[in-house]
């Protein structure tokens, strides 16, 4: 008859490191002690007649274990398989690029170390919930990949890696891990430049706004610009509107940086950069200045006047230009009482980058000069009838300006000059019109007739 | 009846091998374990490990682990065991003893005595 | 490891005397215990099996008895021949372990 050594359980599955009791027993009624064959840890826990108990502990992979027994003169032996578990130690996803260019393809990448048995761990890598590919684990450690086309919607979507041992169907349930997520960013820079608004020309100390925009831009608000005069970065203010980033910023030049110079507009965004570059020119444009050798001049004395400005400035003096570009203009006039209250004017002509650009500056001279009443605004004879309203229309010149009073002979009767007055008899006679300043006086002999009124 | 036969004494010089055997007669050599058993002169038993015939199962005394390799011909019913590296520490008397179980040795051999000198 | 302790180391005897041998286990063993006889220059020779079994071919008067961690060895009526080293061994775990003996010696 032959005899059957059972091992109990069968065939089981546990948890790695786990500890398993496995029982062997047979019918053989004149049985020795029953072995355990195995390269787990054992211990003997118990035995009796034809049965002994074990203690496996420290289960870390799978095992044949075997039950081995004399019985009538021969061996018997049998057997059973431990499938171990063991949930993946470590369930990575690779880092994803900082950023992703949309439309093009990128690598989602998942590494598995561990896990056990192979035969039922599937990995799925996730955008959000949503499973992108499910594939079996397979060697050690399992790397899993799935290409995907990068969308504007990806655009900060959490991307993960999940392992799904299947234990199921040993009734043990489904073991799931995921993996940390990484954020997915993407962006779309058009190939096209920023389109950069800035003026050709740029005086020293003088400040012009400076526009620099990009359209097509995604995410706008991730975007990085950069704007600067030369080596000068220039404080920007950027704005987004829908896909369109606008930076405004002004442009103040300095002293140092005058002669040919760049503006330039960089915007970065995904590791990428468009730029802009536009030519200006940063000039000085001193003047022009126009200069008295006296502001206020004597009557007859000799009068300069000069009219400077920067380098390279051509000037004109009244119509006379000066010999060269940077040079001054200089004219020089004998002081007469017609120059007063004369203006020179002196107009300055730099040429910046084939433009040519004006200014104009002016001068007034005061030339000093004696009192005089003009004879023709003053009437020497005057007939008035008596009780009419009239005016005394005498104009005096001079620098200062003098005053101005006619007083009658042999009186201090005066009467007003350039004001509607009242005429009677007593204001008949010869009067005394005298114009007074610091520089002297000017006298004319007024007569005044006045024809007494018809009695009725 | 039972015997077992162990072959004869070793000379070895240190860091040699050595290789014994112990042929098995009068049972079925599959059906019995088969221990080594150590004695060095003067002194106690030291159990180094067993070998089951029927499965080529071997369990070890973790002492002797790097030391001692157990194993057995079945066509000639003879177990064998190979010591290396072989120091002073290693001259004894090595025993075979079988049994019906794989806790205990009924039947013995004689002994191979193995004395390693330079 | 499962330390097999020993007493005595030496026993004197006189032929025909009643003797105990004992051997102590630093844990439960249950009855996986042997019992070895070693004559001078000769190989061991199981007398006791399992605390208590009878090996065929071993005289009636040794006898066995004991379970968990004390043991014991009788010999009833010493003969001039049982003269040797008694070595007790452990068998429930391995790996398997011997005492140190008990030397038994005439008197």
């Known amino acids: 008859q032959e005899f059957l050594l059972r091992v109990e359980p069968q065939n089981p599955v546990l948890s790695a490191g786990g500890s398993l009791f496995v029982n062997c027993s047979t019918d053989c009624p004149s049985s020795e002690k029953i072995a355990l064959e195995t390269s787990l840890s054992k211990e003997l826990v118990a035995s009796g007649m034809g049965w002994a108990a074990f203690n496996l502990s420290n289960v870390t992979g799978n095992s044949r274990i075997l039950c081995s027994v004399y019985c009538n003169g021969s061996q018997i032996t049998g057997s059973s398989n431990i499938t171990v578990y063991r949930l993946p130690e470590r369930v990575e996803l690779a880092p994803l690029p900082p950023w992703q260019p949309v439309g093009q393809n990128f690598t989602l990448r998942c590494q598995v170390e561990d896990g056990s048995p192979r035969t039922s761990l599937t990995v799925v890598l996730l955008r959000w919930e949503e499973e992108l590919s499910r594939q079996p684990a397979v060697e050690e450690p399992a790397e899993v990949t799935a290409t995907v086309l990068a969308s504007r919607d990806d655009h900060g979507a959490p991307f993960s890696c999940r392992t799904e041992l299947d234990m199921q169907p040993q009734g043990l349930g489904l073991f799931v891990n995921t993996s940390a997520p990484r954020q997915l960013r993407t962006f779309v820079l058009p190939v096209t430049p920023p389109r950069l608004v800035a003026p050709r020309f740029l005086e020293v100390e003088t400040s012009w706004p400076v526009d620099c925009t990009l359209d097509g831009l995604f995410p706008a608000s991730e975007a990085q610009v950069y704007l600067a005069l030369g080596d000068q970065m220039l404080n920007a203010t950027v704005m987004n509107h829908g896909d369109t980033l606008t930076a405004t910023a002004t442009a103040t030049a300095r002293a140092d940086q005058e002669g040919a110079r760049e503006i330039v507009c960089n915007v970065t965004l995904g590791g990428e950069r468009r730029e802009a570059r536009e030519n200006l020119t940063v000039f000085s444009f001193l003047g022009p200045i126009v200069n008295l050798s006296e502001p206020t001049a004597h009557e007859g004395s000799t009068v300069t006047v000069s009219c400077m400005a920067g380098a390279r400035v051509q000037v004109t003096l009244d119509g006379v230009p000066a010999a060269a570009p940077g040079q001054p203009a200089q004219l020089q006039l004998n002081a007469t009482e017609s120059d007063d209250g004369r203006s020179f004017f002196c107009s300055a002509t730099l040429e910046v980058d084939g433009e040519f650009l004006h200014r104009n500056s002016s001068v007034q001279l005061r030339v000093l000069y004696g009192p005089k009443i003009d004879r023709a605004t003053c009437p020497q004879h005057l007939k008035w009838k008596d009780k009419t309203r009239h005016v005394l229309q005498c104009q005096a010149r001079g620098n200062p300006y003098p005053e101005l009073r006619c007083l009658k002979e042999g009186s201090s009767r005066e009467v007003p000059v350039g004001i509607p007055f009242f005429v009677n008899v007593t204001h008949n006679g010869t009067y005394q019109c005298q114009a007074s300043s610091s520089r002297g006086k000017y006298t004319l002999v007024v007569v005044m007739d006045i024809e007494a009124g018809s009695s009725h | 009846q039972v015997q077992l036969q162990q072959s004869g004494a070793e000379l070895a010089k240190p860091g040699a091998s050595v290789k014994m055997s112990c042929k098995a007669s009068?049972?079925?050599?599959?059906?019995?374990?088969m221990h080594w058993v150590k004695q060095r002169p003067g002194q106690g038993l030291e159990w180094i490990g067993y070998i089951n015939p029927n499965t080529d199962y071997t369990e070890y005394n973790q002492k002797f682990k790097d030391k001692a390799t157990l194993t057995a011909d079945k066509s000639s019913s003879t177990a064998f065991m190979q010591l290396s590296s072989l120091t002073s520490e290693d001259s004894a008397v090595y025993y075979c003893a079988s049994s019906r179980d794989a806790y205990h040795g009924t039947y013995w051999g004689q002994g191979t005595l193995v004395t390693v000198s330079a | 490891d499962i330390v097999m302790t020993q007493s005595p180391a030496t026993l004197s005897v006189t032929p025909g005397d009643r003797v105990s041998l004992s051997c102590r286990a630093s844990q439960s063993i249950s009855d996986y215990l042997h019992w070895y006889q070693q004559k001078s220059h000769e190989s061991p020779r199981l007398l006791i099996r399992?605390?208590?079994q009878s090996i065929s071919g071993i005289p009636s008067r040794f006898s066995g008895s004991g379970s968990g961690s004390d043991f014991t060895l009788s010999i009833n009526n010493v003969e001039p021949e049982d003269v040797g080293v008694y070595y007790c061994q452990n068998g429930h775990n391995f790996p398997l372990t011997f005492g140190a003996g008990t030397k038994l010696e005439l008197k």
């Open positions: 399992y605390a208590s």
């Open positions: 009068g049972y079925t050599f599959t059906t019995y374990w």
